[in-house]
């Protein structure tokens, strides 16, 4: 059941100052974990595990909780004030330019290169040329060209919202 709180229920120091464009003092901002009512007079609680709001707001609706995809693990559940935190499973990572999905980490570096960074939930293994020390980025090499290594363990969570 959604709880209902009014601006008057908030302690004076918590009460949000109404925005200038608003005419009524009751039409201010609602605290995290709530959204504003249709008439702007009340704050309505988000539903735990279903939706959330992270900041003081005048949102008509709370935001839908993210559901972790297959290939992801849930590090922390959605609460009324914080979205779900999902992380790629061990051996996979999420790139900045394709945040929708976790990709498999490479199992090793091309011949002539050495691994200097492990697979993490947010990065592939890192390879550098033995001689020059320059980083390698490109296609996954053919199997016979690889030096195998096991995926690294996660170091810290990678949060995705929405």
């Amino acid at each position: 059941e959604s709880a209902l709180i009014t601006q008057q229920d908030l302690a004076p120091q918590q009460r949000a100052a109404p925005q200038q464009k608003r005419s009524s003092p009751s039409e201010g901002l609602c605290p995290p974990g709530h959204h504003i009512s249709e008439d702007g007079r009340d704050c309505i609680s988000c539903k735990y595990g279903q939706d959330y709001s992270t900041h003081w707001n005048d949102l008509l609706f709370c935001l839908r909780c993210t559901r972790c995809d297959s290939g992801e693990v849930e590090l922390s559940p959605c609460t009324t004030t914080r979205n779900t935190v999902c992380q790629c499973e061990e051996g996979t990572f999420r790139e900045e330019d394709s945040p929708e999905m976790c990709r498999k980490c490479r199992t090793g570096c091309p011949r002539g290169m050495v691994k200097v960074g492990d697979c993490t939930p947010w990065s592939d293994i890192e390879c550098v040329h033995k001689e020059s020390g320059t980083k390698h980025s490109g296609e996954v090499p053919a199997v016979e060209e690889t030096v195998t290594s096991s995926p690294g363990t996660p170091a810290s969570p990678c949060s995705l919202s929405g």
Partner: nanobody
Amino acid sequence: EVQLLESGGGLVQPGGSLRLSCAASGRAFSNYAMSWFRQAPGKGLEFVSAINWNGENRYYADSVKGRFTISRDNSKNTLYLQMNSLRAEDTAVYYCAAALSFRLGGEPYGDAYWGQGTLVTVS
């Protein structure tokens, strides 16, 4: 990204009814709050109605309250606006929009996606 396409507009007599549809494609429709805006000839954009991601919460502008009903079918990726007791002042191009939420005044929260609009003429 979400693509939105409105349909269902047309010419109707005062007191008549129309049902607008907004078909969504692309990213998960059910993650988004949806809304209808309208723009009358020579006027600005007006926030008409909005609905949350699962259809449990709805908002209506005073000008349409009791006459318009917003709904959504997440299994069909479609938003609807049932318009009854239409008046001449409802004549406008109607746009659907998707966003994570909408603020009390209608401003989308986060990235917003818009349809091309469908014309409703009440005459």
